[in-house]
């Protein structure tokens, strides 16, 4: 028996369902009574879901997995993982045994988009050219860790005096806070871009200082 899985990682959004595809080619006369199908975590071998001795033996993994029972006889050994969590990320092995056996691993990459950044300034009044200001760009509930970029109004990257921190919450999602310390010119726009490297999703935030008072551009 030969097991086939997708070579590319399966990318799944947090709280959605994912299908880990796995297939085998049944011989003529194949019956499910002959099938041993086991999904397990590749690294630890912890059982995830199994179908052996003609029976679906159920989910051993948070009760969030299911096979496609009607498709098994056709060689579809795919696993459905419901309500994906950050902790589900990793490699899963599909093990199929009929007379002989084979296995293959499929990778699950979990992702969550970052929120539109909110921008804050400190101090936020009586600003004058030459003042040192702290601009904070905050974006929430993303995964995996973000890449953060700052630019000025001319699109020139601002790399000095940037401090970025990322903290995971109890669900494993990251809240990003990036702080830019800059000396104000006569006027200027400062923008931050929060990028999710897996989703290739960019979330933008900016603040424009035009003499007095400062303004925030309307959200897109």
């Amino acid at each position: 028996v030969e097991v086939q899985v997708s070579e590319d990682p399966v990318v799944a959004l947090v709280d959605t369902d994912a299908t880990l595809r796995c297939s085998f080619s049944p011989e003529p006369g194949f019956s499910l009574a002959q099938l041993n199908l086991i999904w397990q975590l590749t690294d630890t071998k912890q059982l995830v879901h199994s179908f052996t001795e003609g029976r679906d033996q159920g989910s051993a993994y948070s009760n969030r997995t299911a096979l496609f029972p009607d498709l098994l006889v056709q060689g579809n050994a795919s696993l459905r993982l419901q309500r994906v969590r950050v902790t589900d990320e990793g490699s899963y092995t599909c093990f199929v045994s009929i007379q002989d056996f084979d296995s293959a691993a499929v990778s699950l990459q979990v992702a969550a988009p970052y929120s539109k950044p909110s921008m804050t300034l400190e101090p936020n009044k009586d600003l004058r050219p030459g003042n040192m200001v702290t601009i904070t760009c905050s974006s929430y509930q993303g995964y995996p860790e973000a890449e953060v970029f700052w630019k000025d109004g001319q699109g020139v990257p601002l790399t000095g005096n940037v401090t970025t921190s990322q903290m995971a919450n109890e669900r494993g999602l990251f809240d990003v806070h990036s702080v830019l310390r800059v000396v104000l010119g006569a006027n200027g726009t400062y923008s931050c871009l929060v990028r999710n490297p897996v989703l290739q999703q960019d979330a933008h935030g900016s603040v424009t200082i035009t003499g007095q008072p400062l303004t925030f551009p309307p959200e897109a």
Epitope: L47, T52, Q57, A60, S97
Partner: antibody, heavy 117, light 106 residues
């Protein structure tokens, strides 16, 4: 016919570990789940975990997860159950049992493990 | 975990009696399994998939039920049937057993 022969009785000290073996014969060892179930004196049956010899997949009862390790040696058709950090309440008969459909259809003779200082 | 509660826990009966043991599950299960255990012996599978007789088990044993309520019936007790009986589920992990029903001679 299917036979599961377990290792002999053990007396162990609190805090120590014990490893019980279960040698299978009369069937294709790699095709069936092997379970471990224990029974304290005068008490009921408690499932500890299981392993599939072919894939090595295992699942443990959360109650024992930090203390139990179930392994197999395919070359000798033998399953092992190791329980660590033993305490007096682990005194029990430990059984290996082979799956049949969704049941444990064949059982070893049991191994008495006594935890005593 | 799915809890299985057997009733009664103790049962006194005579040879020839018809006895019924009930197993109630805290959540719905697909199948129930029944075992017999005699003192100093390993458990023996009697019934699998709720109602199917395991190999070599006499036809006086039968099982039925669905959802959360299952029963084991012995139609006419024989002297060798006095033992402890356990129900077991594998619909979800961990596998669980009932606390047992001890069947004694009246």
């Amino acid at each position: 016919q299917v036979q599961l022969v377990q290792s002999g009785a053990e007396v162990v000290k609190p805090g120590a570990s014990v490893k019980v073996s279960c040698k299978a014969s009369g069937y294709t060892f790699t095709n069936y789940w092997m379970h471990w179930v224990r029974q304290a004196p005068g008490q009921g049956l408690e499932w500890m975990g299981m392993i599939h010899p072919n894939s090595g997949a295992f699942n443990y009862n959360e109650r024992f997860k930090t203390r139990v390790t179930i392994t197999v040696d395919k070359s000798t058709s033998t399953a092992y159950m190791e329980l660590s950090s033993l305490r007096s309440e682990d005194t029990a008969v430990y059984y290996c049992a082979r799956s049949t459909a969704l049941a444990t259809g064949y059982w070893g003779q049991g191994t008495l493990v006594t935890v005593s200082s | 975990d799915i809890q299985l509660t057997q009733s009664p826990s103790f049962l006194s009966a005579s040879v020839g009696d018809r006895v019924t043991i009930t197993c109630s599950a805290s959540s719905s299960v697909s199948y129930m399994y029944w075992y017999q255990q005699k003192p100093g012996k390993s458990p023996k599978l009697l019934i699998y998939d709720t109602s199917n007789l395991a190999s070599g088990v006499p036809s006086r044993f039968s099982g039925s039920g669905s959802g959360t309520e299952y029963t084991l019936t012995i139609s006419s007790l024989q002297p060798e049937d006095f033992a402890t009986y356990y129900c077991q589920q594998w619909s979800s992990y961990p596998l669980t057993f009932g606390q047992g029903t001890k069947l004694e001679i009246k």
